[in-house]
Interface confidence: medium
């Protein structure tokens, strides 16, 4: 990703206490959970690589940045961070690499200031549709989330629950239209074969979308038209063969966009002509001079920008009676 790293930040707000929050006695002001390191000055708690199996109950109320990385949490239940008084200042929550395989509905409820959430590198076989919205209402209260990092959350093949992994993730992103304010979404390294057609239209605030290192073959049914604020679109290391006219026109129409297309297996035949013409004219593609053909064999490693229409032919398809073995 070309933008600054999605590290937990000190961004926060104050918020009213939530009477419905749960959990034990409020922690003492200077209390720090066992196996954690706390800095009140930095408003940061780090419980890193400690093989924790659940979220500590006695998190200090001042926490703004919470790192729970490298643990063995397995399941994040509803209200996993609900406390009395609530963690009203918690703005950045990093749960990456903590062996989570299930995130239940309402797992992040009662975190009124949560702006950044990183669930990367967890094998999420079961991500509830209401993990982020917290309720099954058709329109939920807006989530405060602005940045959602879901890189490499695909579980091993044998742990998937006989359903589309793409569909499961998208259901969680769209439930209750709670993530209308989401500005950064990272979905890299998830073996996505396709992007459900309605997902982007319902995330109109996106500025940064990272779909790199997936297995996307085509963007034909994906519309970028509504994403008028999109600044970066990462599509490196996918299985894209060609971008068609409709996609090219939509990308060109986005006022702030930068698109990253490196390391895709571009097929340089007659269907590539429009894309090559567009590449020569556009300024939205970063590193466009690095894009090369993968197929057909005779075109391998040719630079797309150096192709002309004579190079881009389609072998005629012979009628069955004339085909040779």
């Amino acid at each position: 990703s070309s933008s600054p790293t999605s590290s937990a930040s000190s961004f926060s707000s104050s918020a009213p206490f939530l009477a419905s929050a749960v959990s034990a006695q409020p922690p003492l002001p200077d209390q720090c959970p066992a196996l954690c390191e706390c800095s009140e000055a930095a408003r940061t708690v780090k419980c890193v690589n400690r093989n924790l199996t659940e979220v500590p109950t006695d998190l200090p109320a001042y926490v703004r940045n919470l790192f729970l990385t490298g643990n063995q949490l397995a399941v994040l239940p509803a209200g996993a961070f609900a406390r009395r008084p609530p963690l009203a200042e918690l703005a950045a929550l990093n749960l990456s690499g903590s062996r989570l395989d299930e995130v239940r509905a309402g797992a992040f409820e009662h975190l009124p200031s949560l702006r950044q959430l990183d669930l990367s590198h967890n094998p999420l076989a079961d991500l509830s549709p209401f993990a982020f919205s917290g309720s099954n209402a058709s329109v939920s209260a807006p989530s405060p989330l602005v940045e959602l990092i879901l890189n490499h959350i695909v579980p091993p093949e044998d742990e998937r629950q006989n359903r589309s992994f793409e569909g499961m993730v998208v259901a969680a992103l769209l439930a209750g239209r709670a993530l209308q304010g989401l500005r950064r979404l990272e979905l890299a390294s998830n073996h996505f074969l396709y992007l459900p057609r309605d997902v982007l239209a319902q995330l109109p605030s996106l500025r940064h979308l990272d779909l790199s290192n997936n297995s996307l073959v085509s963007l034909t049914y994906v519309s970028f038209r509504n994403l008028t604020h999109l600044e970066s679109l990462h599509l490196e290391d996918n299985a894209l063969k060609v971008l068609h006219n409709g996609t090219l026109a939509e990308l060109q129409g986005l006022p702030h966009i930068r698109v990253f297309l490196d390391n895709n297996p571009w097929v340089c035949d007659c269907h590539m002509a429009d894309m090559v013409t567009w590449l020569k004219e556009t300024e939205v593609v970063q590193g466009k001079d690095r894009l090369t053909c993968a197929y057909p064999e005779k075109m391998r490693n040719r630079v797309l920008l150096e192709l002309n229409s004579a190079d881009l032919d389609c072998d005629p398809i012979l009628p069955p009676s004339l085909q040779t073995s």
Epitope: S2, S3, P4, T5, S6, S7, S9, S10, F11, R115, Q116, V146, E147, G181, R183, R184, S205, R207, H208, T228, H229, H256
Partner: antibody, heavy 119, light 106 residues
Framework: EVQLQQSGPELVKPGASVKISCKAS????????MHWVKQSHVKSLEWIGR????????TYNQDFKDKASLTVDKSSSTASMELHSLTSEDSAVYYC?????????????WGQGTLVTVS | FVMTQTPKFLLASAGDRVTISCKAS??????VGWYQQKPGQSPKLLIY???NRYTGVPDRFIGSGYGTDFTFTISTVQAEDLAVYFC?????????FGSGTKLEIK
């Protein structure tokens, strides 16, 4: 503690250039955009642009595209802005400002400002 | 996006409730913030995303609004609130500010 320490006031002649700096400390310098803002009596606060210290990528307000150049020196955690072809209209206080979420432009931290006088 | 801020000046006594308005030329969702700039100082972030108080900001500072109309209220003015207040949109680059409201205390 996050701190942005700007260079001192500058008195420059019309047509000249000036480079002002902003030394950052107390956070991961390459992790967040650095923004620059102009404050003058004429136009209040104006956003000039931002730079990504991670890779040097810049985004400018078109009104300042030919006026300002933003750079960073990662080794010293310093952001700089050079102003070109100065006129009296460029006399102002210039601030570096930090947003602590990379997708937003709420400026939670500001430098103390650098006064540039063109005369 | 033009942010039109009114009034330019406000005169209030300690204990008063004051309100500042900011109108965007087009919808900016809830992407508006408010800053306070005391004499001789840099601006300070008070409110972001229209209604969220930044860390450490007293709860007498209140923001509201959505779309094109935004309001900033100081529920009980105190002497130390003497400052210029600015709105800002963070909806789309270039990010733009209102012209400011100078609050003076009687």
């Amino acid at each position: 503690e996050v701190q942005l320490q700007q260079s001192g006031p500058e008195l420059v002649k019309p047509g000249a250039s000036v480079k002002i700096s902003c030394k950052a400390s107390g956070y991961s310098f390459t992790g967040y955009y650095m923004h620059w803002v102009k404050q003058s009596h004429v136009k209040s606060l104006e956003w000039i642009g931002r730079i990504n210290p991670y890779n040097g990528a810049t985004t400018y307000n078109q009104d300042f595209k030919d006026k300002a150049s933003l750079t960073v020196d990662k080794s010293s955690s310093t952001a700089s802005m050079e102003l070109h072809s100065l006129t009296s209209e460029d006399s102002a206080v210039y601030y570096c400002a930090l947003s602590t979420m990379i997708t937003t432009a709420w400026f939670a931290y500001w430098g103390q400002g650098t006064l540039v006088t063109v005369s | 996006f033009v942010m039109t801020q009114t009034p330019k000046f406000l005169l209030a006594s300690a204990g008063d409730r004051v309100t500042i308005s900011c109108k965007a030329s087009q919808s900016v969702s809830n992407d508006v913030g408010w800053y306070q700039q005391k004499p001789g100082q840099s601006p300070k972030l008070l409110i972001y995303f229209a209604s969220n108080r930044y860390t450490g900001v007293p709860d007498r500072f209140i923001g509201s609004g959505y779309g094109t109309d935004f309001t900033f209220t100081i529920s009980t003015v105190q002497a130390e609130d003497l400052a210029v207040y600015f709105c800002q949109q963070d909806y789309s680059s270039p990010f733009t500010f209102g012209s400011g409201t100078k609050l003076e205390i009687k």
